[in-house]
Interface confidence: medium
């Protein structure tokens, strides 16, 4: 028998520095977790102790903190090189700055293979990107070889900016011929490494003949065997075992997100490359693991330029940006309108001639808006200003919901109106009318939404059985502020870009902003 140790990360999202337990900014260092310096300590410890070790990343290193805003992926290449990753799969967020923003800072600079079998380049891009990412890579490990085959969510064109010259194929259809090719090369130990979410990971394990292990990402899935060491609730045991269509037991793993855990999976293969056993658990990277001093020093060096960025002007406002709780928790506020407009603008994807855009709606809990911005400071807006408005380090995500769920959400928005509670919704692409004289749960008297399948966008009544795409904070997607109906009834959830980054990009693009209160949210009494 031959034993392989797979160390894996996924959805790190720019958390190069250690973070608090909820993966936001580290405040009390003695309680902080993760970060590349701590990760390196643990990886090195395992590399010294065990003979056959692979360090893999399942995508979405890009996007999530000011590190990505400033360094745009160069930080990913540099620190992944320093940690000596063996391979990485492309995630959807790796395309957030377009194909050029992937090629220049990451693909050209990475000293490890970057993989995806289901992304095919066409047109002029084909020759430009040729060889910079691969469908698979055969890696020597000790006296053996291991094949790593990559995959990426086929929803990427709706979630990011890959452009028109990359085709995202069905994962299973694309993976099978590449695995077959590896078999003809006498590679009998094959890992599928990719970024399509836990449901697709399980399907790959079931359907793709010849895949021995699946290492996934995208859905931030936490798996654990035994008592979990932190706040995350396991979605299943680690590894999650899938019985393939040809009767093999295929371990599937994921390691939550944000570099909080290091996935640790030990696989035993027989001489024909069959998995005999698999066991392990994610390792919580808490403060009991010291940060490696040389990587930490490197992080400190790179930090020097970040501090200065946060005070630079992004753009100007010529109006007061009312982010006060007195406004945003009671009525339409122009800060809420600004943020929602930025959220929609960040998700413009012209992928179908029938649709002007794939999503037109935004909802945002008023309690998530934490500060106004005064225009009398020469109109200047900085990252620092925006960090006061959106201090929680969340993301603006894409979900699919039925109209009936949205109706429930808007009823919840005003079910205890008047108590300055955070669930009051700010909106974009939605016109809502409330009648507060009616009993809670029956206060939404009009709910119109902006069409997407139209050349001239206009507002139509919400249809209860129709499925709608909505951009919202991850806080709401996870049921925060009492929006349990969103969490329980959402049909799809894809994590998006860092909240401050979305708004800062929009302000930089617009240069001068003047959001108004324009009748998106209205109150009435009496019959309709």
């Amino acid at each position: 028998a031959w034993e392989l140790t797979i160390l894996h990360t996924n959805d790190v999202h720019s958390r190069l520095e250690q973070t608090s337990e909820d993966s936001s900014k580290c405040v009390n260092a003695s309680r902080c977790m993760g970060g590349v310096a701590r990760l390196f300590t643990k990886v090195q410890q395992i590399r010294r102790a065990e003979p056959n070790v692979l360090l893999l990343d399942a995508g979405d290193q890009y996007q999530g903190t000011i590190w990505f805003t400033v360094y745009k992926g160069a930080e990913v290449a540099h620190f992944m090189n320093a940690l000596r990753y063996d391979a990485m799969a492309l995630g959807n967020h790796e395309f957030d700055n377009g194909v050029e923003g992937l090629i220049e800072p990451l693909l050209k600079e990475a000293k490890f293979p970057i993989l995806s079998a289901n992304i095919k380049a066409k047109g002029p891009l084909a020759s430009q990107i040729s060889g910079l990412y691969l469908p698979y890579k055969v890696l020597p490990v000790g006296d053996e070889v291991v094949g790593i085959v990559g995959y990426t969510s086929k929803e990427t064109p709706f979630l990011s900016n890959p452009g028109t010259n990359l085709v995202f194929e069905d994962e299973i259809t694309a993976l099978q011929p590449e695995v077959d090719k590896l078999k003809t090369l006498n590679v009998n130990k094959i890992i599928a490494l990719g970024h399509s979410g836990f449901e697709m990971d399980k399907l790959i394990a079931q359907k793709v003949r010849g895949v021995d292990v699946v290492v996934g990402g995208h859905s931030n899935t936490f798996l654990y065997t035994g008592n979990p060491p932190s706040k995350e609730v396991p979605a299943g045991k680690y590894p999650f075992i899938v019985t393939s269509d040809d009767g093999r037991k295929v371990p599937v793993v994921q390691a939550y997100a944000f570099g909080k855990y290091l996935g640790y999976l030990k696989i035993e293969f027989d001489e024909r490359g069959n998995v005999i056993s698999s066991h392990g658990n994610p390792i919580l990277l808490n403060s009991s693991i010291p940060e490696d001093p040389s990587i930490k020093a490197d992080i400190n060096k790179w930090r020097i330029k970040l501090d200065n960025y946060s005070t630079q002007e992004l753009g100007k406002t010529i109006v007061y940006l009312d982010g006060s709780s007195q406004s945003c928790r009671f009525r339409e506020c122009n800060m809420g309108n600004l943020i929602c407009d930025a959220m929609i603008n960040n998700n413009l994807r012209h992928t179908d001639e029938m649709f002007w855009n794939h999503v037109s709606m935004c909802i945002l809990n008023g309690g998530g808006i934490r500060s106004p911005i005064d225009e009398r400071n020469n109109g200047t807006i900085t990252w620092e200003n925006l960090a006061a408005v959106l201090p929680f380090g969340g993301t603006f995500d894409l979900v699919q919901l039925k109209g009936s769920t949205l109706k429930k959400a808007f009823e919840h928005s005003v079910h205890r109106y008047g108590q300055s509670t955070g669930e009051f919704l700010q909106v974009g692409g939605i016109h809502v009318v409330y009648d507060l004289s009616r009993k809670p749960g029956d206060r939404v008297v009009k709910l119109d939404v902006l069409c997407t399948k139209c050349r001239v966008p206009s507002y139509d009544p919400l249809k209860m059985d129709e499925v709608y795409k909505v951009i919202l904070p991850n806080f709401l997607a996870n049921g925060g502020d009492g929006f349990q109906m969103i969490k329980d009834e959402l049909l799809r959830h894809d994590s998006g870009d860092q909240d401050i980054n979305v708004v800062s990009t929009y302000i930089s693009k617009m240069k001068v902003i003047y959001p108004a209160v324009e009748g998106r949210i209205k109150f009435s009494t009496g019959s309709h």
Epitope: V70, A74, A77, H78, P293, A297, K301, I304, K305
Partner: antibody, heavy 122, light 111 residues
């Protein structure tokens, strides 16, 4: 090999502006900071500011903040430094330099342009 | 801003001798075991050339007779077995915080 080639000498009147260019080659332009430094005769080198071409982020010395603009054109791998409201004490050799911040050099200036003499005289 | 003071202003040596140049920072420029101090050589009419980065690391292509040391606020550039081609100005520079600053320079003359 890494090269930074700057534009030629300039003579300007007080109150005018000057824009100096710095064309980079031999490395990934978008991944390293470009710094601008000046040296007046007999004076110490003075850090003006820098730019990260990958994102266009800039840092400026407070002394020059109101008068200097540093930009970068990714398509031509060229950085620019524009100084306005020139006065006689701005007469100096202006250098661009590549910072080694993506390797262990950490913001040490590992490659320099040849320098551009800017003379401000009425 | 951090002020760097170099001494001596001028150093006159014969070939084969050792040159010791000093740079003192008005504030600590070291952290986590790293010192953000660098040394450059500049000859008349030429751009500066990086000699030493992070206080003690020799830049590639620089002869090993150049070395650097120091931590905190006091740093030294040493040139062993000095040669006539080493006649130049030598500057220190820190990168601990913005703005980065330079020392006023030490002129090294060869007799």
């Amino acid at each position: 090999q890494v090269q930074l080639v700057q534009s030629g000498a300039e003579v300007k009147k007080p109150g005018a502006s000057v824009k100096v260019s710095c064309k980079a080659s031999g490395y990934t332009f978008t991944s390293y900071w470009i710094t601008w430094v000046r040296q007046a005769r007999g004076q110490r080198l003075e850090w003006i500011g820098d730019i990260y071409p990958g994102s266009g982020n800039t840092n400026y010395n407070e002394k020059f903040k109101t008068r200097v603009t540093i930009t970068a054109d990714k398509s031509t791998s060229t950085a620019y430094m524009e100084l306005s409201s020139l006065r006689s004490e701005d007469t100096a050799v202006y250098y661009c330099a590549k910072e080694g911040g993506l390797t262990t050099e950490d913001y040490a200036l590992d490659y320099w342009g040849q320098g551009t003499l800017v003379t401000v005289s009425s | 801003e951090i002020v760097l003071t170099q001494s001596p202003a001028t150093l006159s040596l014969s070939p084969g001798e050792r040159a010791t140049l000093s740079c003192r920072a008005s504030k600590n420029v070291s952290t986590s075991g790293y010192s953000y101090m660098h040394w450059y050589q500049q000859k008349p009419g030429q751009a500066p050339r990086l000699l030493i980065y992070l206080a003690s690391n020799l830049e590639s292509g620089i002869p090993p007779r150049f070395s650097g040391s120091g931590y905190g606020t006091d740093f030294t550039l040493t040139i062993n077995n000095i040669e006539s081609e080493d006649a130049a100005y030598y500057f220190c520079q820190h990168s601990r915080e913005l703005p980065f600053t330079f020392g006023q320079g030490t002129k090294v003359e060869i007799k």
